[in-house]
């Protein structure tokens, strides 16, 4: 476990002609925000693919107005660090995008209105526990001026955050087959955390959360003794057929903790130790609340404003679970046919076909394109005897080996500036516009489109667009 | 031609909750960017929260960490799950749909909310 942290330390326009205009005015004062969304791995995501790593909004900048006719300087920026905390290790490699945000802070009605300003993105490699790193990104017009870094929380270290340190119970050394632990020479290496609850007798563990028995134990927890005979050993009523004496059924039997809590057996009953933000007999009641951000992906958090009162989790859609932690594998299905590689990517299910087919689920069997080849993912499509290639976001030509603008087809609605990145296209709304393309309007004109109000109702005066 | 029918609306009082539902004809929601707005008397209409067509959520600030919007693309409807209602909820809350093809933007009728004890 561990945190990404990230420093703006400027956001204004960058080098060269072709200043932008300043995002505020006297009129329509604003101020700035950021938020970064952080993905494992190198690979090329869809822009609307979850943030896996985690996301983080900073908290709003000063208020700042045009000063008239002075050039856009670099613009106030928000106070303190924009922290993604981290649960598992970290990945070493990892893509981001930082997305600058203005908010309005006109009089309209309804509160303020948001747009947003630029969005920078990138790959990189970074150690945890190293220096901070700088970037400067560009945005059209605007640039991003930054630092980040991974650092482990404790007990974690190590370029990942895999490694356990804690402090050495005697002075000169550490214990049989630990190392000390570097940069921390007065700690030492701790030993694997296993499966909760298992047997730190007769378990071991190679890998995190695993719990392996020693010979002559048994059991998901190696808390089940095997005897040396072909019996199991006594704790129940005698089997006539063998003459052993078979295990009744022991209190954690089946593990009656919930939320991880890890059993172990008292003389009447059981008891449960539970993970933190858990209590109860059985652990089942969760101290989180919201404000705790106990929602993994993405998933937003409704209710548990106390510790009495349970939270929900809405899960984004590719993710289940109570606290959305489990990404849903619905490829297991295999929905693709005829071969077709099936790509889970969260907010839907595409099929990626062979050659020769086509469909949404690579159902139609396409003659005329077999042996036909379309580069970067495009599906070759029979049309009239001929065949040609549906190209993937971002590519086009006769085999899909040229470089598409995805801006081309013009996908930003009511005016939204359409920006090309590596994930695919981004738009930025013009002011009272929202959405992915700018297809929610925030106060919708009074006029035209809008139906009578229902009886009893007076329908808002005409307005202008903020 | 795309048809939005609204329900779900009713008296409901402060703190309580209620789900509004939006049903589109002709069109399945998996295509189309869906909204629900609101007008009380004498306001603007305004944006309370919206599904893109490609599963991003948004919301309105006031709205935050009480209502969620969802698509059920078998029922072909879009939900508004409304917790912790206040009174200055009350409103008439429409269901929109922007339909990409023709960039054109549809309305349906209104159902109202009415959050009073």
């Known amino acids: 476990a561990g945190v990404f942290e990230l420093q703006i330390h400027s956001f204004g326009p960058g080098p060269g002609p072709g200043a932008p205009r300043s995002p505020c005015s006297a009129r329509l004062p604003c101020r700035l925000f950021f938020r970064v969304c952080l993905k494992p791995g190198l690979s090329e995501e869809a822009a609307e693919s979850p943030c896996a790593l985690g996301a983080a909004l900073s908290a709003r900048g000063p208020v700042y107005t045009e000063q008239p006719g002075a050039p856009a300087p670099d613009l106030p920026l928000p106070d303190g660090l924009l922290q993604v905390p981290f649960r598992d290790a970290w990945p070493g490699t990892f893509s981001f995008i930082i997305e600058t945000w203005r908010e309005e802070l006109g009089d309209q009605i309804g509160g303020p209105a948001w747009s947003l300003l630029a969005r920078v993105a990138g790959r990189r490699r970074l150690a945890a526990g190293g220096p901070w790193a700088r970037d400067i990104q560009r945005a059209g017009a605007w640039e991003l001026r930054f630092s980040y870094r991974a650092r482990c929380e404790p007990p974690a270290v190590g370029t990942a955050c895999t490694r356990l340190c804690r402090p050495r119970s005697a002075p000169s050394r550490c214990g049989p087959g630990l190392r000390p632990c570097a940069p921390l020479e007065d700690e030492c290496e701790a030993p694997l955390v296993c499966r909760a609850g298992c047997s730190p007798e007769h378990g071991f563990c190679e890998q995190p959360g695993e719990c392996r028995c020693l010979e002559g134990w048994t059991g998901p927890l190696c808390t089940v003794p095997v005897s040396t005979s072909s019996c199991l050993s006594p704790r129940g009523p005698s089997s006539a057929t063998t003459g052993c004496l078979v295990p009744g059924p022991g209190p954690c039997d089946g593990n009656p903790c919930a939320n991880g809590g890890s059993c172990s057996e008292t003389p009447r009953s059981f008891e449960c130790t539970c993970p933190r933000g858990f209590y109860g007999l059985r652990c089942e009641v969760s101290g989180v609340t919201c404000a705790d951000g106990p929602c993994f992906n993405g998933g937003l958090c409704v209710g548990g404003a106390d510790p009495d009162s349970a939270y929900i989790c809405h899960c984004p859609p590719g993710f289940q679970g109570s606290n959305c932690e489990k990404r849903v594998d619905r490829c297991s299905l295999q929905p693709c046919r005829n071969g077709g590689l099936c790509l889970d990517l969260g907010h839907a299910l595409r099929c990626r076909c062979r050659a020769g087919f086509a469909g949404p689920r690579c159902e139609h069997d396409l003659d005329d394109c077999a042996g036909r080849a379309c580069a970067n993912g495009g599906t070759c499509v029979e049309g009239g005897g001929a065949h040609r290639c549906s190209c993937a976001l971002g590519f086009g030509g006769r085999d899909c080996r040229e470089r598409a603008d995805p801006c081309a087809a013009r996908p930003c609605a009511h005016g939204g500036r359409c920006y090309a990145h590596f994930s695919g296209l981004v738009c930025a709304c013009a002011p009272g516009y929202m959405g992915a393309r700018c297809e929610f309007p925030v106060h919708p004109d009074g006029a035209s489109a809008l139906p009578a109000a229902p009886p009893g109702l007076r329908p808002g005066d005409p307005q202008r667009y903020l | 031609e795309v048809q939005l029918v609204e329900s779900g609306g009713g008296l409901v009082q402060p703190g309580g909750s209620l789900t509004l539902s939006c049903a589109a004809s002709?069109?399945?929601?998996?295509?189309?960017?869906i909204a629900w707005y609101r007008q009380a008397p004498g306001k603007k209409r305004e944006l309370v929260a919206g599904i893109s067509d490609d599963g991003s959520k948004h919301y309105f600030d006031s709205v935050k960490g009480r209502f969620t919007i969802s698509r059920d693309n078998a029922k072909n409807s879009v939900y508004l799950q409304m917790n912790s209602l206040r009174a200055e909820d009350t409103a008439v809350y429409y269901c929109?749909?922007?339909?990409?093809?023709?960039?054109?933007?549809?309305w349906g009728q209104g159902t109202l909310v009415t959050v009073s004890s």
């Open positions: 002709a069109d399945s929601v998996s295509f189309l960017s």
């Open positions: 929109y749909a922007y339909r990409w093809e023709e960039s054109r933007q549809y």
